[in-house]
C-alpha cells in the first residue's frame, strides 16, 4: 500500500503506480507542458524527493472514453 510523502524508487515505485492507477495504466514520463517545455519523469519527481498521491496520479493514463 502507498505511504504518503516518501521517496519511491525501483520496483516499489512501479508497484505503487500500478496500485494507484489500476486498470488505467501509467506513464513513466509526462509530455512537456507549454509552460515548462521539458518533460518530467516519475523518477525525478518521486525517487529523489518525496511525492504524494496526487502527484503519482498525474502519471496515470487517462482511460479511453466510451461512446
Amino acid at each position: 500500500a502507498y505511504r504518503p510523502s516518501e521517496t519511491l524508487c525501483g520496483g516499489e515505485l512501479v508497484d505503487t503506480l500500478q496500485f494507484v492507477c489500476g486498470d488505467r495504466g501509467f506513464y513513466f514520463s509526462r509530455p512537456a507542458s507549454r509552460v515548462s517545455r521539458r518533460s518530467r519523469g516519475i523518477v525525478e519527481e518521486c525517487c529523489f524527493r518525496s511525492c504524494d498521491l496526487a502527484l503519482l496520479e498525474t502519471y496515470c493514463a487517462t482511460p479511453a472514453k466510451s461512446e
Epitope: 524508487c9 525501483g10 520496483g11 516499489e12 515505485l13 512501479v14 508497484d15 513513466f28 523518477v43 525525478e44 525517487c47 529523489f48
Partner: antibody
Framework: EVQLLESGGGLVQPGGSLRLSCAAS????????MDWVRQAPGKGLEWVSV????????IYADSVKGRFTISRDNSKNTLYLQMNSLRAEDTAMYYC?????????????WGQGTMVTVSS | DIQMTQSPSSLSASVGDRVTITCRAS??????LNWYQQRPGKAPRILIY???TLQSGVPSRFSGSGSGTDFTLTISSVQPEDFATYYC?????????FGGGTKVEIK
C-alpha cells in the same frame, strides 16, 4: 558492441582520494541510469551508487554517503566516481554497470572492473 | 534495508546434475529479483531478471522462479562452464542488495 570500460583505480593511502571513470560505448548512454558496484577481495557484491540518466538525481549506499560522489558527462559518454576520505574497507574491485534499476530493472551490462587498494 | 539470504553458500556437483540455489528476501519484493553468474577473475553477468525472465543469450538450462520472499535459480543440467559463483539481487528498493553468493564447484 555494447561496452563499459573502467579506469582510475590504484593504490592510495587511507584518507586519500581517487576518481574512477567508466567510458561507455555501443549504446545511447544518456538514456540509461548508471550504477557503481564493488567487490572486496574474496567477498560478495555490494551496490555503491546510482545516477539518473540526466545526472539530476543520485542515491548512495550508507557506507559511502558523504565520501563518494557519482557524476556523469553525457557529452563524453562517461560515468565517474569521486572517492574521498578513503578507508581500508573501501579496498575492492569497482564495476560500473548499466541497468534500469530506478525502475526495478537489473544490471544488464558490466564493465571489467578497476581495482582500488587503500593501504599505508 | 532489504536483506538477501542465499543458500547454500557452496555446493559440489557433477556435470549433468540438476542444481538448485535459493534466495530469500527479508521482506516481500514481488518479482524484482535478478540472478548473476560470476566466473573467477571476471565481472558478473546477468542470467535472469524479474525472477524468471531469461536474459538474451543465456542457455535455457538456467531458469528462475519465485515471488514475494522466496526465489530459486535452477540449472537443469550443469555444464563445465557453469562452475562459478551465483548471486541474487533485489531491485525492489534502495539500497540495492545482493545475496552472499553460492559457489558451485566440481565434485
Amino acid at each position: 558492441e555494447v561496452q563499459l570500460l573502467e579506469s582510475g583505480g590504484g593504490l592510495v593511502q587511507p584518507g586519500g582520494s581517487l576518481r574512477l571513470s567508466c567510458a561507455a560505448s555501443g549504446f545511447t548512454f544518456s538514456k540509461y541510469e548508471m550504477d557503481w558496484v564493488r567487490q572486496a577481495p574474496g567477498k560478495g557484491l555490494e551496490w555503491v551508487s546510482v545516477i539518473s540518466s540526466s545526472g539530476g538525481g543520485t542515491i548512495y549506499a550508507d557506507s559511502v554517503k558523504g565520501r563518494f560522489t557519482i557524476s556523469r558527462d553525457n557529452s563524453k559518454n562517461t560515468l565517474y566516481l569521486q572517492m574521498n576520505s578513503l578507508r581500508a574497507e573501501d579496498t575492492a574491485m569497482y564495476y560500473c554497470a548499466r541497468g534500469r534499476t530506478l525502475y526495478g530493472g537489473a544490471f544488464d551490462i558490466w564493465g571489467q572492473g578497476t581495482m582500488v587498494t587503500v593501504s599505508s | 534495508d532489504i536483506q538477501m539470504t542465499q543458500s547454500p553458500s557452496s555446493l559440489s556437483a557433477s556435470v549433468g546434475d540438476r542444481v538448485t540455489i535459493t534466495c530469500r528476501a527479508s521482506q516481500p519484493i514481488n518479482t524484482y529479483l535478478n540472478w548473476y553468474q560470476q566466473r573467477p577473475g571476471k565481472a558478473p553477468r546477468i542470467l535472469i531478471y524479474t525472477s524468471s525472465t531469461l536474459q538474451s543469450g543465456v542457455p535455457s538450462r538456467f531458469s528462475g522462479s519465485g515471488s514475494g520472499t522466496d526465489f530459486t535459480l535452477t540449472i537443469s543440467s550443469v555444464q563445465p562452464e557453469d562452475f562459478a559463483t551465483y548471486y541474487c539481487q533485489q531491485s525492489y528498493s534502495f539500497p540495492l542488495t545482493f545475496g552472499g553468493g553460492t559457489k558451485v564447484e566440481i565434485k
